[in-house]
Amino acid sequence: SQVSNLLKQQQTNLTHQKNKLEGQISARQQAEEASQESQNELKEMIETLAWKLNEKSKEQMELHHQNLNLQETLKRVANCSAPCPQDWIWHEENCYLFSTGSFNWEKSQEKCLSLDAKLLKINSTADLDFIQQAISYSSFPFWMGLSRRNPSYPWLWEDGSPLMPHLFRIRGAVSQTYPSGTCAYIQRGAVYAENCILAAFSICQKKANLRAQ
Amino acid sequence: SQVSNLLKQQQTNLTHQKNKLEGQISARQQAEEASQESQNELKEMIETLAWKLNEKSKEQMELHHQNLNLQETLKRVANCSAPCPQDWIWHEENCYLFSTGSFNWEKSQEKCLSLDAKLLKINSTADLDFIQQAISYSSFPFWMGLSRRNPSYPWLWEDGSPLMPHLFRIRGAVSQTYPSGTCAYIQRGAVYAENCILAAFSICQKKANLRAQ
């Protein structure tokens, strides 16, 4: 009975320990569940933050592209090169330069080419009006980009297009043949035919830069 | 002894249960530690993400402001009006218009004013060179914005500033007195004094719009 009592006592201790351990396990299980819950919340939070970060990155990328585009546009526009270079006259779609030196037709043509331009081409009566007005205070002749090899050839502009007869009538040496060809100049609003070898002022013309206007 | 055996068996069971529970507790403890570690990692990750998100927000705000500024600049610049209106010549900081009508000085002055301009003012030898070149193909006189009430008054520009004598020497009727005053014109590169009542061409001048150039 002494052994029995001892065993009973040990059993009681063991039961007590077991209960205690079971209690501990239960508490830990609850804590674990709570921890799991907390971990799930944290993971959710991470997911939300990661999504937000991803969205922000996308937005930022978009803004960055917008910025680059704006800067590019600004670069293009800020140069917004004037319609015409300095010392040229801007009229409608063209830029005009009245030469300050007197040269033969070919040399005048070269001078214009060196300025990325051509000798004057008159496309309309409006063009003619403008030029007549622009040279109204000069009594000098100005070469234009109109010439013919000899009287059996048509009058051609530098770009190869023919002169339209309604624009103006050519005075002067219309029926003459010159070794260097016959060229047209404008003086006091009228157009004359003359030997291309003679020296005169000239009018250069090029397209105005109207992209950014 | 039967009771004793039963108790021993129970004791063995309890010991086994206790050991199992202890094992469980140990495992749970390890899991808990791991969970705690994982939780700490998750918290760290949250902190990092939150910081990154904050940084991104700041960057985005900055980009947004940049964008607004660029758009504002673009608005201003896109209008990028040409330095000078059509038919005017742009040279350095100014626009010049060579009139196509002949009027007295006062009328010429009015014409320029109606175009938001003034009669020509020469500030430097470079200005003079440009004008001399620009009218080199004309033999006509052009009024400029220089006049004097009579020879006992100094030569003044329209803005009231005096003519500096190193710029050019004035030919013509310098010492004359005219009821309408004495005015200066430029012809073939030289400057002359003349009766303001006479008719001549004129040169208008205004500041070029170089804000966006």
């Epitope: - | 020879p151 006992s152 008054y153 100094p154 500096m164 013509g172 010492s175 004359q176």
Partner: antibody, heavy 115, light 107 residues
Framework: QVQLVQSGAEVKKPGASVKVSCKAS????????VHWVRQAPGQGLEWMGA????????AYVQKFQGRVTMTRDTSISTAYMELSRLRSDDTAVYYC????????WGQGTLVTVSS | DIQMTQSPSSVSASVGDRVTITCRAS??????LAWYQQKPGKAPKLLIY???ILESGVPSRFSGSGSGTDYTLTISSLQPEDIATYYC?????????FGQGTKLEIK
């Protein structure tokens, strides 16, 4: 080259008139004013007035107003200065000069007023 | 009328000396000032105009400066042929007035 050549010396009685000529060459006569400056013996320079050959208009110093007349003949590119009612203190060398400032001068004409 | 006052009225200097003559206007003449040299029995000769511009053909030892009412003619290194009387003149407004002259002599 530009030259201004003046007429020779004159001796006049008080109350008389004198007309000094100045012939220009080497430039466009009508483009530049001709000024007249005088210098009494041992004295400084005194501006009398100017004529614009283009228009023929003249400007005179108040002191000489009514006594001096400046004219020109563009056909011979010559300017004239006439001083009337001469007095002894009009004795001086009379110079013509071109433009302002005066870049070319005539050689001078001595006018002596003596009774 | 604008009064022009020159100083000194006469100056004596040695060959090679730097000589300065001043001219004061009774009011501002904004550089409308000329300097003339006159040798005995000769017509005046333009040296400088617009206060500081040397007339062509005039030796570079002559120079002019100044602004407002005060102007200076300088001969950097006096030469024997510079012996003459020097006059300043304002040509801003009529009557165009001269200074009384400065007689330059060699020591």
């Amino acid at each position: 080259q530009v030259q201004l050549v003046q007429s020779g010396a004159e001796v006049k009685k008080p109350g008389a008139s004198v007309k000094v000529s100045c012939k220009a060459s080497g430039y466009t006569f009508t483009d530049y004013e001709v000024h007249w400056v005088r210098q009494a013996p041992g004295q400084g320079l005194e501006w009398m007035g100017a004529i614009h050959p283009g228009s023929g208009g003249a400007a005179y110093v108040q002191k000489f107003q009514g006594r001096v007349t400046m004219t020109r003949d563009t056909s011979i590119s010559t300017a004239y200065m006439e001083l009337s009612r001469l007095r002894s203190d009009d004795t001086a060398v009379y110079y013509c000069a071109r433009w302002l400032p005066m870049d070319y001068w005539g050689q001078g004409t001595l006018v002596t007023v003596s009774s | 009328d604008i009064q022009m006052t020159q100083s000194p009225s006469s100056v004596s200097a040695s060959v090679g000396d730097r000589v300065t003559i001043t001219c004061r206007a009774s009011q501002g003449i904004t550089n409308w000032l000329a300097w003339y040299q006159q040798k005995p029995g000769k017509a005046p000769k333009l040296l400088i105009y617009a206060a500081s511009i040397l007339e062509s053909g005039v030796p570079s030892r002559f120079s002019g400066s100044g602004s407002g009412t005060d102007y200076t003619l300088t001969i950097s290194s006096l030469q024997p042929e510079d012996i003459a009387t020097y006059y300043c003149q304002q040509y801003l407004i009529t009557p165009y007035t001269f200074g009384q002259g400065t007689k330059l002599e060699i020591k």
